[in-house]
Structures are given as C-alpha cells and as structure tokens.
C-alpha cells in the first residue's frame, strides 16, 4: 500500500476516533445502575458521566442534572475530565499537524521535512489515544472495584457504561490511525520513490553547432 493510501486511511480512522472520543466525553453513561423502584414493573436506571448524572424511567422519561460544583466532584471525575478534554484538544492539534504533513496539501514543501511533520501528526494521535485510555481504564477499575467492595451497598453498585466502550473503541481507532500515519510518514522518509514523484531535469536542447558550444574550442 502506498504512503498516500496509508495516510488517508490513518486520517479517516483518527477522525472517526476523535468523534468517538468527543461522544464518550459528553455522554453521561460512564457508569450505569439498574434499580427497581416501588414495583418490579417500574424500572429506573441511573447514569453517571463526567458532566452530569441522569435518571431514566422505563417510561422513557429522562431527568438529567449537571454537576454544580467542580470542587464537590471526586478526584477521579476531575482527573477524567482533564485527561479526556486534553485528549480531545490534542487530537485537534494533531489534525492540523497531520494535514500540514499530508502529501495532498501544500502547507509544507514536499520532502523529508513534510514526512517528519506527518510523522509528528501520527505520534500526536498515538499520544492522544494513550491519554484518553488513562481515564477510561481508571474509571473502569473504580467501577469494577466498587462493584466487588462489600462496604458498598447494592444500591450504589454501578456497571460499566456505554460511554466507556465507545471511548475504548475511539482510543483503538486513534492509535491504529496514528500508527498508520506514522507508517505512511516512515515510508516517505525511507522510500521516497513510493511517495514523492522523482524530479527529472528537463533535457537541454542541443545548439545548432552540435553538442559543444563554440566557447569549448580553443
């Protein structure tokens, strides 16, 4: 596969991953609980996210409450917010770096420097994936640990929410995409013939007197 194709595929995966990460960050489904209230027919589910918590009735009625005070939030939520938002912003920066280093753009002159810019973009996406993976795994660890903690009553036991799974899928796409961008950039630097067109100098037209100019005669 040519480096241009790797670049395009990598960028598409990173963009989808970025979208998934924004979705995971905003969704209130980082941890979910099912709770049966008053009778077994009326099911009530509680969702908790980084920014709000929601209560969903079986009737479909949903009531969400945005967290009031940042200081009142747990360390885990504050750290998860910072890291996830950081990852989203880093992906935004990585997009511009990658576009600048892309073969189809003219921001940077073709050559090894352009390939290095593309490589930087790929590395940024890899870092973005790793950065997002930290809060996702940390949160999942807390949810699982509390689920099996006997001091936590069943009413407070949560399960892994959809946002975590979306987040993990997004980080996988970001890291695979970033890896492909790095591969594409590496192909450019190590095998220029596969990426940049070879510049042949135009042949000089022979003079009327033949191959040699008169000045060559003594």
């Amino acid at each position: 596969m040519g480096s241009a194709a790797l670049e395009i595929l990598g960028l598409v995966l990173c963009l989808v991953g970025w979208g998934g990460l924004i979705l995971a960050c905003g969704l209130p489904m980082w941890q979910v609980t099912a709770f049966l209230d008053h009778n077994i027919v009326t099911a009530q589910t509680t969702w908790k996210g980084l920014w709000m918590s929601c209560v969903v009735q079986s009737t479909g009625h949903m009531q969400c409450k945005v967290y009031d005070s940042v200081l009142a939030l747990s360390t885990e939520v504050q750290a998860a917010r910072a890291l996830t938002v950081g990852a989203v912003l880093l992906a935004f920066v990585a997009l511009f770096v990658t576009l600048a280093g892309a073969q189809c753009t003219t921001c940077v002159a073709p050559g090894p420097a352009k390939a290095r810019v593309a490589l930087t973009g790929g590395v940024l996406y890899l870092l973005c994936g790793l950065l997002a993976l930290v809060p996702l795994c940390w949160f999942a660890n807390i949810v699982v640990r509390e689920f099996y903690d006997p001091s936590v009553p069943v009413s407070q036991k949560y399960e892994l929410g959809a946002a975590l799974y979306i987040g993990w899928a997004a980080t996988a796409l970001l890291m695979v995409g970033g890896g492909l961008l790095c591969c594409g950039a590496w192909v450019c630097t190590s095998r220029p013939d596969l990426s940049f067109p070879v510049k042949y100098s135009a042949p000089r037209r022979p003079t009327a007197t033949g191959d040699y100019d008169k000045k060559n005669y003594v």
Epitope: L36, H38, S151, V154
Partner: antibody, heavy 118, light 113 residues
Framework: QVTLKESGPGILQPSHTLSLTCSFS??????????VNWIRQPSGKGLEWLAS???????YINPSLKNRLTVSKDPSNNQAFLEVTNVDPADTATYYC??????????WGQGVMVTVSS | DIVMTQTPSSQAVSAGEKVTMSCKSS????????????LAWYQQKPGQSPKLLIY???TRESGVPDRFIGSGSGTDFTLTISSVQAEDLADYYC?????????FGSGTKLEIK
C-alpha cells in the same frame, strides 16, 4: 470466635461529647471486607443505625446525625470508636457496636447504656 | 432514606401455633443485578442484644432453626414462625441491607400466651 464489647461514660451532661469504644476479638479491622457498625436503641424503642467504618477506612454515617458523629478505628489494638458531639437527653440509649458482613450486622456487642442528664 | 414499616406492633400466640409478621419498605429492595431482595430479620430477646436470623429475605443464618421462614419480594416481606416455641419470645426487627443509611422497622413484639 467473634466478640465485641462497648465501653463509655455511662452518664454525661447535655452539650458534652460522648466517646464510645468498641473492643473486639476474633477478627481484624485490617482484613478485606471487615467493618464495624454502631447502632443505638432508646429504652423500650426500636433500633437506629448510626455509622459504619470499614477496613479500608471508608465510613458511612446516618445523614440525620452527620454533623455530630465521628467514627474512627485503631486496628492494631482491635478497637473502633464513636464520638457524638453536643449530646442532649434524646441521645439517651443503649449503644451497640456490631461486626459487619456487607450491610448485615452478624455479631453484636452486649451494649452500653448511656444516659444524658443534667 | 428507605422507611421500614412493621405490623403488628405486638402479637400474642400459644406455643405450637404458626405466627406471621409483616414488613413493608418504602421502596423496592430488589437489586436487578442479582434479582435478590435485600431484607434481613433480627431477633432480640429480653435483656439481650439483637441476633441476625435471616438475610436476603429467606436465607437463614447458620444455627437458626428451620421453623423461621422468610418470604416476600419488592416491598412486601413476611417472617413466619411455623411452630412457635417458648424461647421465641422476643422482639423481631426487619432491616433493609440494600442502601445506606441502614434502616430498621419499629419491631414486632411476640408474646407467648
């Protein structure tokens, strides 16, 4: 076998602080899953749960007494503690400590009678 | 908080009779994660500390005679003593072990005729 015993002042004046100690044997408050609960029972009345303290230091306190209750532990001496500040005659009761198995109270102390009176 | 309501407040029965007492919770004690009801029963004999009899609605604590039977689901629970013995003279309390704060019923006093 598991045993728990509460100790305290017996009688104290209103607005003072009640300090109770639960000395236990047969388990350690350093062991995973172990907790100690405090419960009280006014004479001739029902049971009221006050607080829990767990092996990892997490505590749960009854919201109706949140500002007045403090629970702590000394696992090395097999002891748990309850402090109730600013007591009044309504705090007169028998105070129990109990071993927790999740949110169940499976072993209870004999109780200590506390009277708040001027 | 979950409010626990016990009825009757007291009842007198003869030895050998069957007795039932009721406990209602203000919200369901059924946890959807394991489909179990988080309700326990305690027995407190005169001058003694409470003793755990039954938990998870119907599971007897070790050493508890099988004449003590717990049943119910959701918000309505029952403790049945199939054949009352003289030593069963006590106060019986239900407790939800579903959420904090842990709450108890006001108790049912069992008297022997």
């Amino acid at each position: 076998q598991v045993t728990l015993k509460e100790s305290g002042p017996g009688i104290l004046q209103p607005s003072h602080t009640l300090s109770l100690t639960c000395s236990f044997s047969g388990f350690s408050l350093n062991t995973y899953g172990v907790g100690v609960n405090w419960i009280r029972q006014p004479s001739g009345k029902g049971l009221e749960w006050l607080a829990s303290i767990w092996w990892h230091g997490k505590t749960y306190i009854n919201p109706s007494l949140k500002n007045r209750l403090t629970v702590s532990k000394d696992p090395s001496n097999n002891q748990a503690f309850l402090e109730v500040t600013n007591v009044d005659p309504a705090d007169t009761a028998t105070y129990y400590c109990a071993h927790a198995r999740a949110q169940l109270l499976d072993y209870w102390g004999q109780g200590v009678m506390v009277t708040v009176s001027s | 908080d979950i409010v626990m309501t016990q009825t009757p407040s007291s009842q007198a029965v003869s030895a050998g009779e069957k007795v039932t007492m009721s406990c209602k919770s203000s919200q369901s004690l059924l946890y959807s994660g394991d489909q179990k009801n988080y309700l326990a029963w305690y027995q407190q004999k005169p001058g003694q500390s409470p003793k755990l009899l039954i938990y998870l609605t119907s599971t007897r604590e070790s050493g508890v005679p099988d004449r003590f039977i717990g049943s119910g689901s959701g918000t309505d629970f029952t403790l049945t003593i199939s054949s009352v013995q003289a030593e069963d003279l006590a106060d019986y309390y239900c407790q939800q072990h579903y959420s904090y704060p842990l709450t108890f019923g006001s108790g049912t006093k069992l008297e022997i005729k």
